[in-house]
Structures are given as structure tokens and as C-alpha cells.
Interface confidence: low
């Protein structure tokens, strides 16, 4: 099953978010992921846990998965890189590199996205981006253009009650709120940007979508600068 | 240190079948691609396949499509080439080589070879 | 498929001199361009990666350049380990394709 979904939000601007990727397993929608560098594309570990024996291929230049469109273009992935704390039973450094099988071909279509490298809290209430093909509703309708919503990025006390995440949520991970406009178990792998800079991935962690008290949880890019520029160098 | 050593080579008829391993040590076989290059006596090295590091992407040169089969095994830290309706241009030192990680494709450490001769 | 244009397919030099080996590519490759030695009897071993990246261990007296879709290996210095067949290889685009070689003697 693909891992992602936006709930509570609206199909995005053809073609507005540039750095924004598909990555798929045998020709499938399974997960977001942003371009952080011509080669690069920025997702979360856990995606390939559903990936053993398929080909997984990256999508960019997308609006529409099925239609024809001038921008869109199927990569090969030649490399891929978990993060290597990663663990299947975690969130926590839940971040996966993958190398494209040669630079992706950029126009407007197709563009990096900057991501953030000072390691410090975006200021809650701050209301950032996320997209994704994920599912729209509880029926679980697949979209096939990219959806988006505008979420408050909520503090991490708040985040971390019992009544909410319960402490999970380390200083390596952010919070969004989550009251009927959410993201999901997917769109794991898609970017959170807040003023135009990447500062969160969608964890795939599962959890309740769409519940004010479940937060929807981001892993911070800040924190990983130095294994990001490792990887890329 | 880098090692990689292949095995599996030897005297096959046309249309008869082998499979290539490479045993690797010395470095994180996951984290890599690997390629499979062979040479005819005489000749210039010439790439066969390739599969990157955890085998989502393979490549054939066009002459071993359908013919050739290249896997990896990373927990036993070993790739394998499996060939079938073997033809006499076959015939080569097939070496396993490591796919550098510093952008598009080549071959940063080679192996010995085994050779591979097809003849009636 | 990407041809790879190399020459001169042989050439005899003197130790201490300078040589230049060219490839040609028939279409863009940016710096996708690796050079090779293969000493007599042995395997192909990297020498340059990314057009004029030195591999690990390699002297400093081997040197590669791109100008367009032609490439340079030059060997400064020569010595008598240097004798072997050089080839290039594009890593633009499957498949990869290797130069024809260049075969360096020593006079």
C-alpha cells in the first residue's frame, strides 16, 4: 500500500513545487520526497521497508501521475542511503538518501529545494507547506495530482504530552498540528517547508491522521546537516 | 583493503549456462553498485551489467539482455552473474568491479577476473 | 549508445617526457569521464574519476581535463612503470562505453 496522504487540504498549483517527488516501487506511488541537490532526492528511511524485491524509481517534474506531461521524467535510483541509525521499530532518524542514476534535467518544472542548515526550532504557530499523493480521505481515495496543505507548526512541549506523543518527540523531530488537515502514514518522505526552505520530512511512522491530539511528527533536516552534506559530498 | 575475487569461470559449449560469484571484503558492500566488465583477449574492457547498492536499478548492455542475470546477495557481501545461451563472444576475462559513489558511473576497484571460454 | 573516440591508439615516448592521451565523446557527458591503466598482463585499474579527479594512491604526475565532449589524460614526468594500455570510459548514460585504448611504450 503506498504510504501517504494529505487530509483536509486542496490539489496543489501544477507544477509550483518543483522540488517535489514521487518515489515509487514497481511503477507505484509509495512515497514523497524532495530534491535536495541535482543527484539527490531527500525521503524517509521507512519507505523502502515495503521495497525488498521491487524496483524503486523516483518521479519527478509531476503534477498528474497518470497523465502525460512535458516535465515529467522516471529516474533510476543508483544509490540509496538510510540514514544508519534508522530502525523499523522508531521514527527517530528516519531519513533516506537516494541517488538519481545521473542528474535530474532542471527547468521550471524541476528545481532543488533549499533546506534548512541552522539547527534551530521553527517558531511554533509558523505555518508551513506539505505535499503529497498520498490518500485525501478515511475511504482511503488515492489522489492523482499532488495535494497540499498549510499547517501551524505546534510547539514541542505541547506535542510531547501524555495526551499526545508522550515524550517521543526528541529535539531532532517537530510537530505539526493536525486537527482535520494532516498529513500521514506517507506522504512519509514529503517536505515540510516553512518561508520557502526545507526545515521537516514527513515521518512514516504509523499513526491516527487527522487527530488534533496526534500531531502530525517531522523530522528536522537542520539536525542531519552534516550527514545530508556527508552523503552528498 | 579492497577485495574483490571472482569464481565460477570455465570451458562452457554454445547455448550452455554459468554463474559468476564475487566474493568482496574490505569495505560496506551495501553502500555500493556493482558492475560486471568483461574483456576478450586483445580487446578493450567492455561493460556487461551493473546493480546498484540494494538492488532497486539494473543495467544490461543490449548484446546480454535476456541472457545475463546480475544479483547481489549483501548479507553474504557477494554479487553474482548468471549467464545462459552463452555464444562464443562470450569468451572474456569477466571482472566484478565497485561502482564509485562520486557521481554518475565507474569502476573504482577491480577484481582478478575468471575467465570465461565458449566453444564447441 | 555513447561512442568514445580515443587516440592515439599507440604511441612511444621517452622517460621524463610529457604525453597526452585524448578521448572524444559523440554527444555531452559533462565530467562523466574516467580514465584507466592496464599494465601488461594485469587488470584495468582507475586512475582519474569525474575528468581530472585523481583515484586514491595515484601520482600526482597524472592529470585529466575537459574541454567540451574532449578529454585529456596527461602524464608528466614518464617513467618506466607508466608502459600499459590506457582506456577511457563515459559514465554519462548506459551503457558505459570504454575508448578503444592507447597503447604507451617506452623508447
Known amino acids: 500500500p503506498p504510504r501517504g496522504r494529505i487530509l483536509g487540504g486542496r490539489e496543489a498549483e501544477a507544477h509550483a513545487r518543483p522540488y517535489m517527488a514521487s518515489v515509487q516501487l514497481n511503477g507505484a506511488h509509495l512515497c514523497g520526497g524532495v530534491l535536495v541537490a541535482e543527484q539527490w532526492v531527500l525521503s524517509a528511511a521507512h519507505c523502502l521497508e515495503d521495497a525488498a524485491d521491487g524496483k524503486v524509481q523516483v518521479l519527478l517534474g509531476a503534477h498528474s501521475l497518470s497523465q502525460p506531461e512535458p516535465s515529467k521524467r522516471l529516474y533510476d535510483v543508483l544509490r540509496a542511503v538510510p540514514h544508519p541509525d534508522s530502525q523499523p521499530d522508531t521514527i527517530d532518524h528516519d531519513l533516506l538518501l537516494l541517488q538519481l542514476s545521473e542528474k535530474a534535467t532542471l527547468g521550471p518544472a524541476v528545481r532543488p529545494l533549499p533546506w534548512q542548515r541552522v539547527d534551530r526550532d521553527v517558531a511554533p504557530g509558523t505555518l508551513c507547506d506539505v505535499a503529497g499523493w498520498g490518500i485525501v480521505n478515511h475511504a482511503g481515495r488515492r489522489p492523482d495530482s499532488l495535494q497540499h496543505v498549510l499547517l501551524p507548526v505546534l510547539d514541542r512541549a505541547t506535542c510531547n504530552r501524555r495526551t499526545h506523543h508522550d515524550g517521543a518527540i526528541t529535539e531532532r523531530l517537530m510537530c505539526a498540528e493536525s486537527n482535520r488537515r494532516d498529513s500521514c502514514k506517507g506522504d512519509s518522505g514529503g517536505p515540510l517547508v516553512c518561508g520557502g526552505v526545507l526545515e521537516g520530512v514527513v515521518t512514516s511512522g504509523s499513526r491516527v491522521c487527522g487527530n488534533r491530539k496526534k500531531p502530525g511528527i517531522y523530522t528536522r533536516v537542520a539536525s542531519y546537516a552534516a550527514w545530508i552534506d556527508s552523503v552528498l559530498a | 583493503e579492497v577485495k574483490l575475487v571472482e569464481s565460477g569461470g570455465g570451458l562452457v559449449q554454445p547455448g550452455g549456462s554459468l554463474k559468476l560469484s564475487c566474493a568482496t571484503s574490505g569495505f560496506t558492500f551495501s553502500d555500493y553498485g556493482m558492475a560486471w566488465v568483461r574483456q576478450a583477449p586483445g580487446k578493450g574492457p567492455e561493460w556487461v551489467a551493473f546493480?546498484?547498492?540494494?538492488?532497486?536499478?539494473?543495467y544490461y548492455v543490449d548484446i546480454v539482455m535476456g541472457r545475463f542475470t546480475i544479483s547481489r546477495e549483501n548479507a553474504k557481501n557477494t554479487l553474482y552473474l548468471e549467464m545462459s545461451s552463452l555464444r562464443s563472444e562470450d569468451t572474456a576475462m569477466y571482472y566484478c568491479?565497485?561502482?564509485?559513489?562520486?557521481?554518475?558511473?565507474?569502476?573504482?576497484?577491480w577484481g582478478q577476473g575468471t575467465s570465461v571460454t565458449v566453444s564447441s | 549508445d555513447i561512442q568514445m573516440n580515443q587516440s592515439p591508439s599507440s604511441l612511444s615516448a621517452s622517460l621524463g617526457d610529457t604525453i597526452t592521451i585524448t578521448c572524444h565523446a559523440s554527444?555531452?557527458?559533462?565530467?562523466?569521464l574516467s580514465w584507466y591503466q592496464q599494465k601488461p598482463g594485469n587488470i584495468p585499474e582507475l586512475l582519474i574519476y569525474k575528468a581530472s579527479n585523481l583515484h586514491t594512491g595515484v601520482p600526482s604526475r597524472f592529470s585529466g581535463n575537459r574541454s567540451g565532449t574532449s578529454f585529456t589524460l596527461t602524464i608528466s614526468s614518464l617513467q618506466p612503470e607508466d608502459i600499459g594500455t590506457y582506456f577511457c570510459?563515459?559514465?554519462?548514460?548506459?551503457?558505459?562505453?570504454f575508448g578503444a585504448g592507447t597503447k604507451l611504450e617506452i623508447k
Open positions: 568491479a565497485r561502482v564509485g559513489l562520486y557521481g554518475n558511473f565507474f569502476m573504482d576497484y
Open positions: 570510459q563515459q559514465g554519462q548514460s548506459y551503457p558505459l562505453t
Open positions: 546493480i546498484s547498492n540494494l538492488a532497486y536499478s539494473f
Open positions: 554527444q555531452n557527458i559533462n565530467v562523466w
